[in-house]
């Protein structure tokens, strides 16, 4: 099944998806799309890039905030809602037939826990849990390339995922906080 | 008003060849995928092929690999399925439908009766 | 290839009931499912597509549900135009497959 990846409403959810261009500079078309990754293309796509740049998104809430012309195509979706929810496909468009990288990823939107933070705990609570725990590491939710090798010289890093889930709990017992 | 408009179909003998056309209009041909399925009389549907956008990507179902050929000219916001060694097995209404995963709309359907 | 089965092969329904289509796949299509409807000597219509997202211009009274191998076509209040044949696809292994059909007939 889908690596799942959690982000509370109104934060900004983060999908990772990455390849790597050989030579690099040599980049290939990536799209993103709600839904599983169907047969073909992306299906309900929220983000299409070609060679060269990102050149159709359905929404400003979609980017590309890491180095995409570096292979990095991981998808941030801004101030999310309970609406984002759901299966996300990362297709990475690898040139000749069925050659494309196809990844899906879960998301998964969370209300914000109820927090009382006690009187000595001043910092803001987005900067007081910076860290994530990481549960494992997954190769590719699926990964089809049954076809002939593409023409240009394309190596496709392994895709990896980690589960990752915010440990607000944990934290906020550190910090004295309380829970409600 | 998006319309696909499917010609060609007709009688042919078994390994000749017919050449269906599909003319659309009123949308941007070159923004999408088109598709060819398949029904023959009193069956189900069955995909046939797929071009991408561009036509830089082209699909086949196994049974009629490397004996149809299909694409697109966006110049004349048409796509083609050549079908040559016709066998009676490809008897069918050909629809040409928009899209790759999912068909939406559909033509009326062209007869291909593959016959001595 | 993945083989989709569609239950019953005729339902008989009478006009203003409920009807309920099965559509079995043999392993997991996700939510990469949509449904057709034919009338005799027409062209296919499209329905509703990632399992249950109506396609533009179908009446709410039809609904899809379902994901992975398991879903369903509900009509809620059958009208006379509603008498077809309704069939299911999968879009999410290769090659694109086609249920045979389910024939929704007058009782």
């Known amino acids: 099944s889908e690596v799942e990846y959690i982000a509370e409403v109104g934060q900004n959810a983060y999908l990772p998806c990455s390849y790597t261009p050989a030579p690099p500079g040599n980049l290939v078309p990536v799209c993103w799309g709600k839904g599983a990754c169907p047969v073909f293309d992306c299906s309900n796509v929220v983000l299409r890039t070609d060679n060269r740049d990102v050149n159709d998104r359905t929404s400003g809430r979609y980017w590309l905030k890491g180095d995409f012309h570096k292979g990095d195509v991981s998808l941030t979706i801004e101030n999310v809602t309970l609406a984002d929810s759901g299966v996300y496909c990362c297709r990475i468009q690898i040139p000749g037939i069925m050659n494309d990288e196809k990844h899906n990823v879960k998301l998964v939107v969370i209300k914000p826990a109820k927090v009382t933070p006690a009187p000595t705990l001043q910092r803001d609570l987005t900067s007081a849990f910076p860290r994530m725990l990481t549960t494992g590491e997954h190769g590719p939710a699926e990964t089809q390339t049954p076809g002939s090798l593409p023409d240009v010289n394309l190596t496709v890093s392994n895709f990896f995922c980690e589960l990752q889930i915010f440990t607000l709990t944990n934290e906020l017992r550190d910090s004295g906080a309380t829970i409600r | 008003e998006v319309q696909l408009v499917e010609s060609g179909g007709g009688l042919v003998q078994p390994g000749g060849s017919l050449r269906l056309s599909c003319a659309a209009s009123?949308?941007?041909?070159?923004?999408?995928?088109m598709s060819w399925v398949r029904q023959a009389p009193g069956k189900g549907l069955e995909w046939v092929a797929n071009?991408?956008?561009?036509?830089?990507?082209?699909y086949y179902v196994d049974s009629v690999k490397g004996r149809f050929t299909i694409s697109g000219d966006n110049a004349k916001n048409s796509v083609y399925l050549q079908m040559n060694s016709l066998r009676a097995e490809d008897t069918a209404v050909y629809y040409c439908a928009r899209g790759s995963n999912w068909f939406d709309p559909w033509g009326q359907g062209t007869l291909v009766t593959v016959s001595s | 290839e993945t083989v989709m089965t569609q239950s019953p092969a005729i339902l008989s329904v009478s006009p203003g009931e409920r009807a309920t289509l099965s559509c079995r796949a043999s392993q997991s299509v996700y939510s990469n499912l949509a449904w057709y409807q034919q009338k005799l000597g027409q062209a296919p219509r499209l329905l509703i597509y990632d399992a249950s997202t109506r396609a533009t211009g179908i009446p709410a009274r039809f609904s899809g549900s379902g994901s992975g191998t398991e879903f369903t076509l509900t009509i809620s209040s059958l009208q006379s135009e509603d008498f077809a044949v309704y069939y299911c696809?999968?879009?999410?292994?290769?090659?694109?497959?086609f249920g045979q059909g389910t024939r929704l007939e007058i009782k």
């Open positions: 696809q999968q879009y999410n292994n290769w090659p694109i497959t």
């Open positions: 009123g949308f941007t041909f070159s923004s999408y995928w």
């Open positions: 071009i991408k956008r561009g036509g830089s990507e082209r």
